[in-house]
Interface confidence: low
Amino acid sequence: IVGGKVCPKGECPWQVLLLVNGAQLCGGTLINTIWVVSAAHCFDKIKNWRNLIAVLGEHDLSEHDGDEQSRRVAQVIIPSTYVPGTTNHDIALLRLHQPVVLTDHVVPLCLPERTFSERTLAFVRFSLVSGWGQLLDRGATALELMVLNVPRLMTQDCLQQSRKVGDSPNITEYMFCAGYSDGSKDSCKGDSGGPHATHYRGTWYLTGIVSWGQGCATVGHFGVYTRVSQYIEWLQKLMRSEPRPGVLLRAPFP
Amino acid sequence: ANAFLEELRPGSLERECKEEQCSFEEAREIFKDAERTKLFWISYSDGDQCASSPCQNGGSCKDQLQSYICFCLPAFEGRNCETHKDDQLICVNENGGCEQYCSDHTGTKRSCRCHEGYSLLADGVSCTPTVEYPCGKIPILEKRNASKPQGR
């Protein structure tokens, strides 16, 4: 997170830290006791699927305070439409091997109903993004969980206000832009997969997933987030289906 | 529409202002009271805009210069109280007033619903947690807010 602040301990209780072979991989969002939402691109280069760990209740990576809960990732489900190395359909659903125990420091973020997300949450201007990613483009990653308030843009406005870059990916209907184009604040590498959380009338909801950008906090560019509202039925159907063998599963979308 | 005027000094009113055209000052002499004179003058000088009973659905009318104001019963709104508030109570308008989820129904009022782990309150719009750790709430902030001293 560039230009953010420390999320006070316990105030981002749905934040997940994903580790592979003990090393920081990505962020994620707890949506109930056994399911985590993250970004598909986080898993492009994974070889040791059995060494994936999700940590809940984490705050400061340099110390263990007893509120952390670690769970093995039993399954990673990615939409069949996602192509590794690209940006569209950048979403993954992770099933934990065992459920986490909800506490003051471990709480799920609400996965909203699609219509509510599209016609109400999408028009809430500011939302929070969080993670332990880089504090500057090409800089060091954070030890304490960072958080940033970002404004959402209509895709048309995002395209008009962004500098044209020759090989820049399209902003599809499965994404949205949020943040600032003045180079001051953005999510960054290492925050990928983490939550874009929107507050409405006292409750927080998952509206986006940290996905991609032209560098981090680059002048003339916004952060791009996976538009979760497009995947709500897909996520719900998967969460209600019986588990399948194998860690990586490509599930038909839509 | 302005029956109260008939009670006021009827003899002088007939003589000065109904049989002949009177001025504001002459009317002031009759009513002896600025507020009552003003009410009379609005109606007298440009006609009673409430005469056509423009306020619908039981609304009451107040005449103004070249216009009128409707005071609507609680369930109605609009210039002429023509709009039933429930007709505006649809999900695209401010989420139908619902705290969480909203469903439109043809022929009946929209209904509000709550996320799993919450229940709808008797007001039909608010949601209350039914589990210790409902999604989307931050326990340490909820507890901090709950322990703040309340204003009296």
């Epitope: 006791t33 459920p99 125990v101 909800l102 209600r240 | 619903r113 782990g117 709808l120």
Partner: antibody, heavy 122, light 107 residues
Framework: QVQLQESGPGLVKPSQTLSLTCTVS?????????WSWIRQPPGKGLEWIGY???????NYNPSLKSRVTISVDTSKNQFSLKLSSVTAADTAVYYC???????????????WGQGTSVTVSS | EIVLTQSPATLSLSPGERATLSCRAS??????LHWYQQKPGEAPRLLIK???QPATGIPARFSGSGSGTDFTLTISSLEPEDFAVYYC?????????FGQGTKLEIK
């Protein structure tokens, strides 16, 4: 094949504590399910009492909460129900059950014990 | 708590006929509603989960529909073994609640 078997006394005196145990076979109780108790008074419908996760977190029906304790013993692959201060109204068939809880708290009860009848009488 | 009202209380039909059982919720459940069948002296059996998804091993003649507050369990052509009591269950909010049941009896 998952199997659940309730056990405990069939007769309990009023004001005493009803204690039942559910032994699970064919599945590790320390896996990802919720383990519930549900009861059915004679000739009546079903009433959910509460559940416990393998981890020990519980959720009880508010109407019974002050009298109910559900606990788990992972070493024996068992979970238990204690209902204190019983009256004749607690006479029922008591079922233990497993909810395959893939989606948060939407408990579709896929596996049931055969039920044990408990009478509260002096 | 969410109250589930099942209707009719008793339904008398003959084998081969179509049965339609209703469950109405006092507030919206989305599709968090499950159906069970119970025969005398037996534990209930899960038939339909999430309003319309058949549980494992349930014959195709059983189907569920609805969302929000109104739900229906349909048995397309009754078999003799289908005569039993059917319950709907709220899986949306705690406390989990059941309907009072519909008894399906042979005419």
């Amino acid at each position: 094949q998952v199997q659940l078997q309730e056990s405990g006394p069939g007769l309990v005196k009023p004001s005493q504590t009803l204690s039942l145990t559910c032994t699970v076979s064919g599945y590790s109780i320390s896996s990802d399910s919720a383990w519930s108790w549900i009861r059915q008074p004679p000739g009546k419908g079903l009433e959910w009492i509460g559940y416990i996760y393998y981890s020990g977190s519980t959720n009880y029906n508010p109407s019974l909460k002050s009298r109910v304790t559900i606990s788990v013993d992972t070493s024996k692959n068992q979970f238990s129900l204690k209902l204190s201060s019983v009256t004749a109204a607690d006479t029922a068939v008591y079922y233990c059950a497993r909810s395959v809880n893939y989606y948060g708290n939407s408990f579709a009860v896929g596996y049931w014990g055969q039920g044990t009848s408990v009478t509260v009488s002096s | 708590e969410i109250v589930l009202t099942q209707s009719p209380a008793t339904l008398s039909l003959s084998p081969g006929e179509r049965a339609t059982l209703s469950c109405r919720a006092s507030q919206g459940l989305s599709d968090y509603l499950h159906w069970y069948q119970q025969k005398p002296g037996e534990a209930p059996r899960l038939l339909i989960k999430y309003a319309s998804q058949p549980a494992t091993g349930i014959p195709a003649r059983f189907s569920g529909s609805g969302s929000g507050t109104d739900f229906t369990l349909t048995i397309s052509s009754l078999e003799p073994e289908d005569f039993a009591v059917y319950y709907c269950q709220n899986g949306h909010s705690f406390p989990l609640t059941f309907g009072q049941g519909t008894k399906l009896e042979i005419k």
